[in-house]
C-alpha cells in the first residue's frame, strides 16, 4: 500500500532534483576554475542533509550551515549586485558585465535557482508531489529558508559600493517584505559597505518620471541612512539601451542618458 503523504499547497520537488544539483555544481566548477576544489558530492550531501528526513515546515538556517560552509565564496568590493522583482534583467546584466555578481552567479545561488525541493519527516524520500507554500502552508520551508540563509550571507559579505536593481513598474518599487527588503538590506555591514546605489528600472518607453522620488525609495533611503550607509539612486529609463550600452559603451548613443 502506498504510504500516506502530507499534501502541501505548493508544487513538488523539481524533477531529477539530485541530478540537477550535481550537474549544476560540476558545470559551475567548469565555468569558474577557481572553484575546482569544490567536491560536488559533498555539496549535494550537505544540501540533502539540510532537508531530508526533516519536517518541511520546521527548517532552520542552522540546517543549511554545512552547505554554506562548503559554498564559501567572496565577491570583490564594489561588485555585488542585489535585485528585487527584476531577476531576469539583473542576470542579463551580470552575463554582460562579467565582473559583477548576483547571488545566482555564486555557487549556492546557481545550484538552487528556479528549483523547488522538500523532504518528509522521518523518511529519506524527496517529495516530488508537493512542497509547502510560503503563504498557504509555512514560511520555514526548505526553499524559503535556503534563500533567506544564502541571501543573508551574500549581504553580510558585500563590501564597497553595493548596487541593487529595483523594478520601477511595480506598485512598491522597494518592498519591505521582499528578500531584499527583509533580509539583505538589514545585513549589509556599515563598516564594510560605503554606499548602496539603487537602479530603478523603468518599464514604459515614455515613462520619464523620476522614480527615485517614489515614497518607497525614500523609505529605503531612510532605512539605509539610519544604518550609516550612504544611499544613491539612478533612474534607468531605457533598460534595453542600458544593456546595449553595457555591451558597447563606446556606442555614440550611449554618451547620452539611459
Amino acid at each position: 500500500l502506498p504510504r500516506w503523504r502530507q499534501q502541501w499547497s505548493g508544487s513538488g520537488t523539481t524533477s531529477r532534483f539530485p541530478e540537477t544539483v550535481l550537474a549544476r555544481c560540476v558545470k559551475y566548477t567548469e565555468v569558474h576554475p577557481e572553484m575546482r576544489h569544490v567536491d560536488c558530492q559533498s555539496v549535494w550531501d550537505a544540501f540533502k542533509g539540510a532537508f531530508i528526513s526533516k519536517y518541511p515546515c520546521n527548517i532552520t538556517e542552522e540546517d543549511y550551515q554545512p552547505l554554506v560552509k562548503l559554498g564559501t565564496q567572496t565577491v570583490p568590493c564594489n561588485k555585488t549586485l542585489l535585485w528585487s522583482r527584476i531577476k531576469d534583467l539583473a542576470h542579463q546584466f551580470t552575463q554582460v558585465q562579467r565582473d559583477m555578481f548576483t547571488l545566482e552567479d555564486m555557487l549556492l545561488g546557481y545550484l538552487a535557482d528556479d528549483l523547488t525541493w522538500c523532504g518528509e519527516f522521518n523518511t529519506f524520500e524527496i517529495n516530488y508531489q508537493s512542497c509547502p507554500d510560503w503563504r498557504k502552508d509555512c514560511s520555514n520551508n526548505p526553499v524559503s529558508v535556503f534563500w533567506k540563509t544564502v541571501s543573508r550571507r551574500f549581504a553580510e559579505t558585500a563590501c564597497g559600493v553595493v548596487h541593487v536593481m529595483l523594478n520601477g513598474s511595480r506598485s512598491k518599487i522597494f518592498d519591505k517584505n521582499s528578500t531584499f527588503g527583509s533580509v539583505e538590506v538589514h545585513n549589509l555591514q556599515p563598516e564594510k559597505v560605503q554606499a548602496l546605489e539603487a537602479w530603478v528600472i523603468h518599464g514604459g518607453r515614455e515613462d520619464s518620471r523620476d522614480l527615485c522620488q517614489d515614497p518607497t525609495i525614500k523609505e529605503l533611503e531612510s532605512i539605509i541612512s539610519k544604518r550609516n550607509i550612504r544611499f544613491f539612486c539612478k533612474n534607468i529609463y531605457r533598460p534595453d539601451k542600458f544593456l546595449q550600452c553595457v555591451k558597447n559603451p563606446e556606442d555614440s548613443s550611449c554618451l547620452s542618458g539611459i
Epitope: P18, E19, L22, A23, V26, T29, R36, H37, V38, D39
Partner: antibody, heavy 119, light 111 residues
Framework: QVQLLESGGGLVQPGGSLKLSCVAS????????MNWVRQAPGKGLEWIGK????????NYTPSLKDKFFISRDNAKNTLYLQMTKVRSEDTALYYC????????????WGQGTTLTVSS | EIVMTQSPASLSASLGQRATISCRAS??????????VHWYQQKSGQPPKLLIY???NLESGVPARFSGSGSGTDFTLTIHPVESEDVATYYC?????????FGSGTKLEIK
C-alpha cells in the same frame, strides 16, 4: 597560471628509497586533492594514489600500498612521494596531477621527474 | 578493480577525416548523474592534457573537433576533422571507484 613542478628524480639502486617533490603555484594548493601518476618508458599511465587537502585521506593503487607513501605540506605548497624498496619496474616518469574533484578528472599535470632504478 | 580496455592500439587517419577511439570498462562507470570517464591527449615528450571530462564534456580551451560519448561500459572519443597537431597518444581514464585506472592508450598517426 596553474603550475606543477616535480623534482627529486634520479638514479637509485634496487631496494633503495627516494622522495619526490611537486611544488604547486597559481592556485590555492591547500584546497585541492592531489595525485601521483607514473609512466614507464614507452608504456601507458598508472595511477599511484591521491591525498585530500588536509592529509586525512590518502588512497593508493593496491599494488603500491605498502611501498609508496604520499604526503603534503600545505605551508610549502608541496606534494611528496616517498618511494621505498624500489625495483627496476619502478623506473618511470613520475607526474603530479591536480584532481578536479567534482569530475574525477586530472585537470593539471606537471612535466614529470624521472626515476631510474638500476644497479 | 575496473579494467579499461582501449582500442585500437594505433590508428592512422587522413587529414580532415574522422578518427574514433573506443574504451570499454570491465564494469559500469556510470551513476544516475554522470559517467566517470575522461579522455587525455599526450603528445611526445609532454604530460597528458585533459580533453574530455565525464564522458562528453569538453574541457575549456579544447577545440570543438574533439567529442566524447557513451555511458555504462562503452565510451568513444571522436576527432573530426583530424588535424596534423592531433598526432598523439590518447588515454581513457575512469574515476568511478578506487583504484582509478587508465586505458592502455591509442596512438594516432596521420596518413
Amino acid at each position: 597560471q596553474v603550475q606543477l613542478l616535480e623534482s627529486g628524480g634520479g638514479l637509485v639502486q634496487p631496494g633503495g628509497s627516494l622522495k619526490l617533490s611537486c611544488v604547486a603555484s597559481g592556485f590555492d594548493f591547500s584546497l585541492y586533492w592531489m595525485n601521483w601518476v607514473r609512466q614507464a618508458p614507452g608504456k601507458g599511465l598508472e595511477w599511484i594514489g591521491k591525498i585530500n587537502p588536509d592529509s586525512s585521506t590518502i588512497n593508493y593503487t593496491p599494488s603500491l600500498k605498502d611501498k609508496f607513501f604520499i604526503s603534503r605540506d600545505n605551508a610549502k605548497n608541496t606534494l611528496y612521494l616517498q618511494m621505498t624498496k624500489v625495483r627496476s619496474e619502478d623506473t618511470a616518469l613520475y607526474y603530479c596531477a591536480r584532481l578536479w574533484i567534482a569530475t574525477g578528472g586530472f585537470d593539471y599535470w606537471g612535466q614529470g621527474t624521472t626515476l631510474t632504478v638500476s644497479s | 578493480e575496473i579494467v579499461m580496455t582501449q582500442s585500437p592500439a594505433s590508428l592512422s587517419a587522413s587529414l580532415g577525416q574522422r578518427a574514433t577511439i573506443s574504451c570499454r570498462a570491465s564494469s559500469s562507470v556510470s551513476s544516475s548523474a554522470f559517467s566517470y570517464v575522461h579522455w587525455y591527449q599526450q603528445k611526445s615528450g609532454q604530460p597528458p592534457k585533459l580533453l574530455i571530462y565525464l564522458a562528453s564534456n569538453l574541457e575549456s580551451g579544447v577545440p570543438a573537433r574533439f567529442s566524447g560519448s557513451g555511458s555504462g561500459t562503452d565510451f568513444t572519443l571522436t576527432i573530426h576533422p583530424v588535424e596534423s597537431e592531433d598526432v598523439a597518444t590518447y588515454y581513457c581514464h575512469h574515476s568511478r571507484e578506487l583504484p582509478f585506472t587508465f586505458g592502455s592508450g591509442t596512438k594516432l598517426e596521420i596518413k
